[in-house]
């Protein structure tokens, strides 16, 4: 059995973010159980002190692309579009830089979902990131037509 | 079906260089670590090191760091050890295991092995 | 660099509980160390079981759980089965690498 498809997101979480759009997942039962962590985590997320708002208003549809990627529509085998390095690097150095310190040291949060790690992602020139999913953080753009 | 299988094992003499290979069927590796992990004959296990074949970026063993090399080619679905300035403690069995980048799944699936003996 | 430490061996019966550990040189091992569980039956099959402390891996069966015991990670086993004999080797992460235990030969007699 192969693993990796491409299937619709049909959860509720992420529905703000993702839609109905086919997503990329590890495994054919994979998206009920992160969908429920999901929104465990996001409860707690909501509930807790240790989210500012210019954090939150990136981080929620930042982690649901990283939860739920689109499946990369230009590959003839499933596979998943990843996030912006570029945008990764300022979410967690600057908007987020408190809050991963503390997920970092709280991995249970996530559950079954890892942090994303900036450095696993292409950098932003190669052809690898031609195709990553952008959530339009002002600075990330500004940083992207400029250099 | 997933499956790891490494090769590029044999004899080699001490000083001398190899490079194995991890060729992934089943899945993407973009998607995964790939880890090296070895075994001396009648020892535990020892972490060589990982990559993540998306970016490039390794980790590596204080052990053979320096002397050992690991990459990835997404085309063609497989990751590399290059070893380089052999050591008679490098025989062992070497393995190549995957671990989801974005789930905490464990290492599921490992290959078979390939024994690489250093010796004179 | 950090030494994980195991028991060398362990002896259970079928359909009883047994738990391994793992003990880590530079204190209590926590959450952030992302201990992992693996198993090697004979011809160096290896599987892994647990990640992340106590995520099982898709298709482990649920009597293998893992999880935080005072200061070391441990591996449970309830209700043993025969085929459950093989060596666990656990691992630690530390920021930048990964250090296996000794591993722990498990006879189920």
């Known amino acids: 059995e192969e693993d990796g498809f491409c299937q619709p997101y049909r959860g509720i979480a992420c529905a703000r973010f993702i839609g109905n759009r086919t997503v990329y997942m590890e495994s054919l039962h994979m998206q009920g159980e992160i969908e429920n962590q999901i929104t465990a985590a996001f409860t707690m997320i909501g509930t807790s002190s240790h989210l500012s708002d210019k954090c939150s208003q990136f981080a929620i549809p930042s982690l649901c692309h990283y939860a739920f990627p689109y499946c990369d529509e230009t590959s003839s085998v499933p596979k998943p579009r990843d996030l912006c390095r570029d945008e990764c690097e300022i979410l967690e150095n600057v908007l987020c830089q408190t809050e991963y310190i503390f997920a970092r040291s709280n991995p249970m949060i996530l559950m079954r979902l890892k942090l994303p790690n900036c450095e696993d992602l292409p950098q932003p020139e190669s052809p690898e990131a031609a195709n990553c999913i952008r959530i339009g953080i002002p600075m990330a753009d500004h940083h992207h037509h400029h250099h | 079906e997933v499956q790891l299988v490494e090769s590029g094992g044999g004899l080699v003499q001490p000083g001398g260089s190899l490079r194995l290979s991890c060729a992934a069927s089943?899945?993407?590796?973009?998607?995964?670590?790939i880890h090296w992990v070895r075994q001396a004959p009648g020892k535990g296990l020892e972490w060589v090191g990982q990559?993540?074949?998306?970016?490039?970026?390794?980790y590596s063993a204080d052990s053979v760091k320096g002397r050992f090399t690991i990459s990835a080619d997404t085309s063609k679905n497989t990751a590399y050890l290059q070893m380089n300035s052999l050591r008679a403690e490098d025989t062992a069995v070497y393995y190549c295991?995957?671990?989801?980048?974005?789930?905490?799944?464990?290492?599921?699936?490992w290959g078979q092995g390939t024994l690489v003996t250093v010796s004179s | 660099q950090a030494v994980v430490t195991q028991e060398s061996a362990l002896t259970t019966s079928p359909g009883e509980t047994v738990t391994l550990t793992c003990r880590s040189s530079?204190?209590?091992?926590?959450?952030?160390?992302?201990a992992n569980w693996v198993q090697e039956k004979p011809d160096h099959l290896f599987t892994g079981l647990i990640g992340?402390?106590?995520k099982r891996a898709p298709g482990v069966p649920a009597r293998f759980s893992g999880s935080l015991i005072g200061d070391k990670a441990a591996l449970t086993i309830t209700g043993a089965q025969t085929e459950d004999e093989a060596i666990y080797f656990c691992?630690?992460?530390?920021?930048?690498?990964?250090?296996f235990g000794g591993g722990t030969k498990l006879t189920v007699l």
């Open positions: 990559i993540s074949p998306n970016s490039g970026s390794t």
């Open positions: 992340g402390t106590n």
């Open positions: 530079t204190g209590a091992v926590t959450t952030s160390n992302y």
């Open positions: 089943g899945f993407n590796i973009t998607g995964y670590y």
């Open positions: 691992a630690l992460w530390y920021s930048n690498l990964w250090v």
């Open positions: 295991a995957r671990d989801s980048r974005r789930y905490v799944l464990s290492w599921d699936y």
